[in-house]
Interface confidence: medium
């Protein structure tokens, strides 16, 4: 039987009618165009709904958009369109929602062609009010908050000035001109990237990196032949031209760019491309492109400095620049990646990783799964997941894999169980694991998404017909009930709850359709007094993430500390609460040579956890720039991993020696540097 | 029945040398870590050494690093304490002690006493 | 490394007593803490770990509460064989360390 038809499962109690009474019905006066959703704060309840219309007309397209505004979690909207006075918003701009709590909301306006500059309508009491603000530029890019502090903003025009505003929009300067990216770092520092001749496309490669840390009183060139920039972490990235060809590197900086250091890893040519797949601020997952048109690359790890890097995983799927690539962090659990491979027959295949890279395997076949036709041994196979690259490819994969920080262990994904990703309709798993084991939770494609912190599980059927049913699940996944929302189905467009998993409430998104007109409309369902009391200790079990043998010492040890997590029992019905803070309790493990990684001139031979010398660079000047400058390196052959905490143990200690560096890429070193002032 | 019984213990001269053994029995050995806790005659107890269960890391702390050595022996079921240049303040009752990954000190031995004076 | 205060150093009682001993961390060690018992002549015996969590076996009137730093064994009703010495150990951290200890014996 499918899960949650067997006898074993228990029934929520009087579901229907308790769901009933929190089902809220909204129907949008309003003709169907497309509808953006933006929560505003966080427990807040405040929902901002967009609705635009377009109307194609013979010389010009007149377009119509109405603002909503929900403040009990979507269960009521009122027309708040009078406060932006009535105005046409650009939709591609979006609702630029403030950072944290701020309450700021920026709108950009539709305006006429003649027009001096473009047009905003702020707020910074939760979307209550709105101020219009006619502004000296058009933008070309969306308004970006500064994230230390919200009334700090800036913006790119159309002719390429960098604009910054100081009090959330009400006055604008322009700081720079032609400005191609601009990005906020940390302490309200601004960098940006500035074209000398002609233009950011003509004159890529040829890029300056900027920097200033007051807003635009001052500047400091931190870079020169510049292709690309990009922040991760505490890291900054340069993609920089090489001197003699056309080839680029990547250089790093962890001060803000005053130093640079050449990273370890392979130049690009200019058919190719560098990506930081994530990163925070112990390390970074980097990809680098192979030479032609081949789709994949090679992800490499980085050290705590960003400079040297080890190589993850061999043939990784990565579509051209700004393309697809399946690399998803599991939120729910420390130092776990999914991504996909290109094989040699060309098939994708999924790979995990539990270890922050350290190594890669197939994910374990579900239990309760067949192989299907893909497998060549019927016995042995693996779960395979569908991510961007499937959804890219218009496969039937509505969504891709889910995972929540503070419903530990929990990820949903579709996938197929073969040898590789199959074309046929996928199903829906759930590992409750972190992605070490998992199960077939529901047959064929759903939306899905995770409320109260992991307590329920809801989703839709993916359908072409129109639909009124959704399912959900009080023990992750096992069990699933039915509930019908409406008697009239609706074409389904989404699934909206709010950010974080921690509500309690879902919004079911989509439009009706009758022979006259097609109305946005929405459902809000609580699941409150499914989830009648709240949860107490004796809902809780202790769990160890990463266990994969419990009688043994080390088992759970990953980056060189174990976990334990208080987590709900599956057959608890109660609710965490949005208050509920993730229970987990670390301590700290002896520390092995896979605790650490070999540092810049090292290797580890295959099957082999030593690192030795390169014997390539036996005796070799290395090209090697740390800090831009000629120095001795010294390295004991070993750095410990980024994040790990391991203590004790193995200590590798070998002679120290002077790797003697000549330095071939010094053009971003401090000499070259220069500073001004406005 | 888990158990584990320490020996070796005796009276030994400041300098001296001296080999504690734990035999272990009721349990797979080879899976846990194990640690030497002393208690002082004072009746403080402090820990002294962890191996892990396949013996390949060890830890110590501060005052006998460098003069004590952990190991064992898993197709024996021992675990060993060699303790070189030993002291005075190293007199004590040594436990041999059972490490799971939930629980670090889950099952103690009856210990054995060291004496070291001249 | 982290010192671990345990107070009292000992305490009377009587059958039927309520007894609390408590431990203090000199930094935060999460719930990365056991209590032990030792008896004269015996081995010492696990009785709580992870702060909260009771030993298979062990009975229902021992109960141990705080993480962070601050930490209680509480014997909601002493019996005649609870006379013991007890002691907390961290485990957060290497080098574990335990507390001072504290003996339980008859008013």
């Known amino acids: 039987s499918a899960p949650g038809e067997d006898e074993e499962c228990g029934r929520v109690r009087d579901f229907v009618a308790k769901l009933a009474n929190n089902t809220h019905q909204h129907v949008f006066d309003d003709l169907r165009g497309s509808v953006s959703l933006s929560w505003v704060g966080d427990s807040t309840g405040v929902i901002l709904v967009l609705t635009t219309f377009h109307v194609p007309l013979v010389i010009m397209t007149f377009g119509q958009s109405k603002l909503y505004r929900s403040e009990d979690y979507g269960k009521n909207f009122k027309d708040i369109t009078d406060l932006i006075n009535n105005t046409f918003i650009r939709t591609e701009f979006g609702m630029a929602i403030g950072p944290e709590n701020s309450g700021k909301v920026v709108l950009t306006a539709e305006v006429s062609g003649g027009s001096r500059g473009g047009r905003i309508f702020r707020s910074s009491d939760f979307a209550k009010n709105f101020v219009q603000t006619d502004l000296p530029f058009h933008p070309l890019t969306q308004m970006m908050y500064s994230p230390q502090n919200s009334d700090y903003l800036l913006a790119l025009s159309t002719e390429n000035g960098l604009w910054v505003s100081k009090n959330f929009g009400g006055k604008w300067e322009e700081i720079h001109k032609a400005v191609c990216l601009a990005k906020w770092g940390s302490d309200n520092t601004i960098f940006f990237t500035t074209y000398a001749n002609g233009s950011c496309k003509a004159d890529l490669g040829a890029l300056e990196l900027w920097r200033t840390s007051d807003l635009g009183k001052s500047f400091k060139t931190i870079g020169v032949k510049i292709y690309s920039f990009g922040l991760g972490g505490r890291f900054l990235f340069a993609s920089v031209m090489a001197d003699k060809d056309t080839t680029r590197r990547i250089h790093v900086s962890t001060d803000q760019g005053d130093t640079w250091s050449m990273a370890q890893l392979p130049s690009v040519g200019q058919e190719q491309f560098y990506s930081i797949l994530a990163a925070n601020d112990d390390m970074v997952f980097m990809h680098v492109d192979e030479p032609g048109d081949t789709g994949f690359g090679t992800i490499f790890t980085s050290d705590d400095r960003g400079i040297v890097y080890s190589k993850s995983l061999d043939r990784h799927l990565y579509t051209t620049t700004g393309g697809e690539t399946d690399f998803t962090n599991v939120t729910s659990l420390r130092g776990v990646y999914i991504t996909s491979v290109l094989s040699e027959d060309n098939s994708i295949q999924t790979m995990i990783t539990f270890d922050q890279g350290g190594r890669w395997t197939h994910l374990r076949k579900p239990e309760n799964s067949e192989c299907d036709a893909t497998a060549k041994n019927k016995n042995e196979c693996s779960l395979h997941i569908h991510a961007s690259y499937s959804i890219s490819q218009k496969l039937n994969v509505p969504m891709a894999p889910l995972s929540e920080p503070n419903a530990v262990g929990i990820v949903i994904a579709h996938g197929s169980v073969g040898d590789a990703i199959s074309v046929m309709v996928p199903d829906v798993y759930i590992s409750d694991d972190g992605g070490y084991s998992w199960t077939k939770m529901l047959e064929g494609p759903h939306y899905y998404t995770i409320l109260d912190s992991g307590g329920i599980i809801v989703a839709i059927e993916h359908s072409s017909r129109p639909i009124n049913v959704i399912k959900f699940s009080t023990d992750e996944g096992q069990c699933w009930q039915t509930y019908t929302f409406t008697r009239d189905p609706i074409y389904f467009t989404g699934l909206a709850s709010e950010p974080g998993a921690r509500s309690m409430n879902i919004s079911i998104w989509g439009f009706t359709e009758s022979f006259l007109t097609s109305q946005w409309v929405s459902y809000t369902i609580d699941f409150k007094d499914i989830l009648e009391r709240n949860c107490e200790e004796k809902d809780y079990t202790i769990w160890l993430a990463h266990s994969t043998d419990p009688e043994d010492y080390e088992d759970g040890c990953i980056l060189g500390y174990k976990e334990q997590f208080l987590r709900l029992r599956k057959s608890s019905v109660c609710q965490n609460g949005r208050d509920y803070v993730v229970t987990k309790q670390p301590s700290i493990c002896l520390c092995s040579l896979e605790d650490f990684l070999c540092d810049f001139g090292y290797y580890r031979p295959e099957n082999d956890s030593k690192c030795v010398e390169q014997p390539e660079l036996k005796g070799h000047d290395l090209e090697f720039c740390l800090y831009g400058r000629e120095e001795h390196l010294t390295t004991n052959g070993y750095r410990k991993i980024p994040g790990d905490k391991c203590q004790g143990g193995v200590n590798p200690v070998r002679e120290v020696k002077d790797l003697k560096k000549k330095c071939t890429s010094n053009f971003l070193s401090p000499e070259k540097q220069n500073s001004k002032s406005n | 029945e888990v158990q584990l019984v320490e020996s070796g213990g005796g009276l030994v001269q400041p300098g001296g040398s001296l080999r504690l053994s734990c035999a272990a029995s009721?349990?797979?050995?080879?899976?846990?870590?194990m640690s030497w806790v002393r208690q002082a005659p004072d009746k403080r107890l402090e820990w002294v050494a962890i191996i892990s269960s396949g013996g390949s890391y060890t830890y110590y702390s501060d005052t006998v690093k460098g003069r004590f050595t952990i190991s064992r022996d898993n197709s024996k079921n021992s675990l060993y304490l060699q303790m070189n240049s030993l002291r005075a303040e190293d007199t004590a009752v040594y436990y041999c002690s059972r490490s799971s990954s939930h629980w670090y000190f889950d099952v103690w031995g009856q210990g054995t006493l060291v004496t070291v004076s001249s | 490394d982290i010192q671990m205060t345990q107070s009292p150093s000992s305490v009377s009682a009587s059958v039927g007593d309520r007894v609390t001993i408590t431990c203090h961390a000199s930094q935060g060690i999460s719930s990365n803490i056991g209590w032990l018992q030792q008896k004269p002549g015996k081995a010492f015996k696990g009785l709580i770990y992870?702060?909260?969590n009771l030993k298979d076996g062990v009975p229902s009137r021992f109960s141990g509460s705080g993480s962070g730093a601050d930490f209680t064994l509480t014997i909601s009703s002493l019996q005649p064989e609870d006379f013991a010495d007890y002691f907390c150990v961290q485990y957060a951290q290497f080098p574990y360390t335990f507390g001072q200890g504290t003996k339980v014996e008859k008013r």
């Open positions: 992870h702060g909260t």
């Open positions: 009721g349990f797979t050995f080879s899976t846990y870590g």
